[in-house]
């Protein structure tokens, strides 16, 4: 699977269950790990900090003792466990630690992990709420007039709304500059689309729309392949055995595999 | 201890400067103020630190105007770029200098960086189709005000358009819809008191002009035996290729 660095992670859990939030800070020799919660429209607030050397959680005043627990599966790895979830536990959870980069001062700055969105809901959803892709290939008008082509990747019927999309050429790890619409609610699920405009010289390359979502099959990034487009003048081959529908639209079945 | 960011949101064009205000209350005599940038992905990135006993902090395009007596610590971002669009948080740090210290945050100010004022530019309009799905792609226009209409007699559903800033600092937009008669759907756009149609951009081609998916050796290619050199699609239908994943 491709590696979407940093950024969007989500965990969806029903009420009264537990959730695990993994800290993605790669800090060696951290003495304390702090846990913050940010809920939309509010100020981020610290919930607790974990004393690494004494393996002890220190909660902010007013928080119930059994609610939060920091688990350390191995050295320099931390997981926040939340118990007895309620909908109001929903929000973005961050781990953080002080980076004393400048020895002349007591501390320099607080570094935050990339954040995990916790969604606590009892909504009854379909068994499969992974993003369902539909692809759009460039219009011939665009490729002819503008010497460029736009690929569009539509993703529908996913839950929760936390999703990350990026684009790459087939044999490259370089993330290409793309654009996307806001995530839109449709009934109880969400849809989003992203598009990539490439110059004419790149139309003969295969492109990939790479999607990270909590409910992707096997937990790996979903890769949607956009085939290369050849825009030269050629002749039809009557022996071509590709099936076409009545509208002469070529139908291809793309296997959903991820490296 | 309290931090107040009164501006919930602010908009400013590229190249200009924006100042984000932050007031705080503290009984500590010595402390630090931190500014963070929260990306749309929710990542929280440290920008700059202001010490209560230090000169105004400056780091690249970020500068702090610190007034200790007024308990005010304003962040100025100069020479704004489109990538500066984000939510900015002001945070007060405990004075202890200990690794257990917490940050007290404000509610944040959302900064939206807009394109600069520039000449009005007429959009290009293209239609892309896949099965019942139709997308109207509207490229490189200014100003932002636009009405996009997918013209069809058999609408199933339509979505609000996405209007975003293009890399060139103009606007791009996409409007999606589902239609029973997708083959006949066209797109018309009202912009700057003029109407532009997708049909204005259609290329008249003869029947020998085709576009095909290029031969490729990728193992993730379609399972049908269609991705060999002879898999050919009519040019005018290239954007109707349906890949069902």
């Amino acid at each position: 699977s491709s590696n979407l660095e940093g950024g969007t992670k989500s965990v969806t859990r029903p009420t009264r269950s537990s959730a695990e939030i993994t800290c993605d800070l790669t800090v060696i020799n951290a003495f304390y790990i702090h846990w913050y919660l940010h809920q939309e429209g509010k100020a981020p607030q610290r919930l607790l900090y974990y004393d690494v050397s004494n393996s002890k959680d220190v909660l902010e005043s007013g928080l119930s003792p059994g609610k939060y627990y920091t688990h350390t599966p191995r050295r320099w790895s931390w997981i926040l466990i939340l118990r007895n979830l309620i909908e109001n536990d929903s929000g973005v959870y961050y781990c953080a630690t002080w980076d004393r980069g400048n020895p002349k001062t007591h501390y320099y700055k607080k570094l935050f992990g990339s954040g995990t969105t916790l969604v606590v809901t009892d909504k009854q959803l379909d068994a499969d709420v992974s993003p369902k892709p539909t692809i759009f290939l460039p219009s011939i008008a665009e490729t002819k007039l503008q010497k460029a082509g736009t690929y569009l990747c539509l993703l529908e019927k996913f839950f929760p709304d936390v999703i990350k999309i990026h684009w790459q050429e087939k044999k490259s790890n370089t993330i290409l500059g793309s654009q996307e619409g806001n995530t839109m609610k449709t009934n109880d699920t969400y849809m989003k689309f992203s598009w990539l405009t490439v110059p004419e010289k790149s139309l003969d390359k295969e492109h990939r729309c790479i999607v990270r979502h909590e409910n992707n099959k096997n937990g790996v990034d979903q890769e949607i392949i956009f085939p290369p487009i050849k825009t030269d003048v050629i002749t039809m081959d009557p022996k071509d055995n590709c099936s076409k529908d009545a509208n002469d639209t070529l139908l291809l079945q793309l296997t959903n595999t991820s490296a | 201890q309290k931090v107040t960011q009164a501006q919930s949101s602010v908009s400013m064009p590229v190249r200009k400067a924006v100042t984000l205000n932050c007031l705080y209350e503290t009984s500590w005599w010595s402390y630090y103020i931190f500014w963070y940038k929260q990306l749309p992905s929710k990542e929280m990135i440290f920008l700059i630190r202001q010490g209560s006993d230090e000169q105004n902090a400056k780091s690249g395009r970020y500068s702090v105007n610190f007034k200790k007596a007024a308990k005010s610590v304003a962040l100025t971002i100069s020479a704004l770029q489109l990538e500066d669009s984000a939510k900015y948080f002001c945070a007060l740090g405990d004075p202890g200098g200990l690794n257990t210290d917490k940050l007290i945050f404000g509610k944040g100010t959302r900064v939206t960086v807009e394109p600069r004022s520039q000449p009005h530019t007429k959009p290009s309009v293209f239609v892309m189709k896949n099965g019942t799905n139709v997308a109207c792609l509207v490229k490189e226009f200014y100003p932002k005000d636009i009405r996009i209409n997918l013209v069809s007699s058999k609408k199933i559903t339509e979505f609000d358009p996405a209007i975003v800033i293009s890399p060139s600092g103009k606007y791009n937009a996409v409007k999606l819809g589902k239609y029973e008669d997708s083959n006949s759907v066209t797109c018309s756009v009202q912009h700057d008191n003029k109407t532009v149609h997708s049909t204005d951009f259609e290329v008249k081609t003869d029947s020998t002009d085709h576009v095909k998916p290029k031969e490729t050796e990728n193992t993730k290619q379609p399972s049908k035996s269609c991705h060999k050199p002879k898999a050919i699609v009519h040019t005018e239908k290239v954007n109707m290729m349906s890949l069902t994943v």
Partner: antibody
Framework: QVQLQQSGPQLVKPGASVKLSCKAS????????INWVKQRPGQGLEWIGW????????DYNGKFKGKATLTVDTSSSSAYMELHSLTSEDSAVYFC??????????????WGQGTSVTVSS | DVVMTQTPLTLSVTVGQPASISCKSS???????????LNWLLQRPGQSPKLLIY???KLESGVPDRFSGSGSGTDFKLKISRVEAEDLGVYYC?????????CGAGTKLELK
Amino acid sequence: QVQLQQSGPQLVKPGASVKLSCKASGYTFTSYDINWVKQRPGQGLEWIGWIYPGDGTTDYNGKFKGKATLTVDTSSSSAYMELHSLTSEDSAVYFCARMDDYDDGGAMDYWGQGTSVTVSS
Amino acid sequence: DVVMTQTPLTLSVTVGQPASISCKSSQSLLHSNGKTYLNWLLQRPGQSPKLLIYLVSKLESGVPDRFSGSGSGTDFKLKISRVEAEDLGVYYCLQATHFPLTCGAGTKLELK
């Protein structure tokens, strides 16, 4: 005072390319667009495009896309225009001009002295 | 593209007399920000163009106040209250409201 100093006259062969320069002084180079304008002998002014030295973004008159490439070197406060695949139609005087922000006046307030390009075999 | 039509193409005047040049655009030059980006330039013989007036009527610094600009929408005028010898040359109206920027063909001001 604000000045735009352009490179000297050029005699070039058809099919070749030529790169014209425009050195700015007397103001903050990265804060204003640099425009390029074409004037054929005895003719009017034709806008080619502009570049913003602050970030290198460009915008071209569609007629000159592929014909002209605009670049800047902020270290020397210089703007450049390269003209490709030259023909006799490209014989002209080319001006660079500073343009202020659209929030101010959006006007080309200072002009270079012009560079004459003659395309001839 | 927006077409800028200047009249007259040539204007013969006597020093000390007034002069007026008209410029019409094929569409309104009112920008969405409320401003009208219509400039007047003067190109003296053998020289580069020089900005006289911007935003229809604003005089560029250093330009004598005998020059004035007026108009709105699609109709614009440049007036010289009393022509002087140094005013001779070709006057261009230039619009910067619509992309691409376009100029009129020019009006040649000459002495009678």
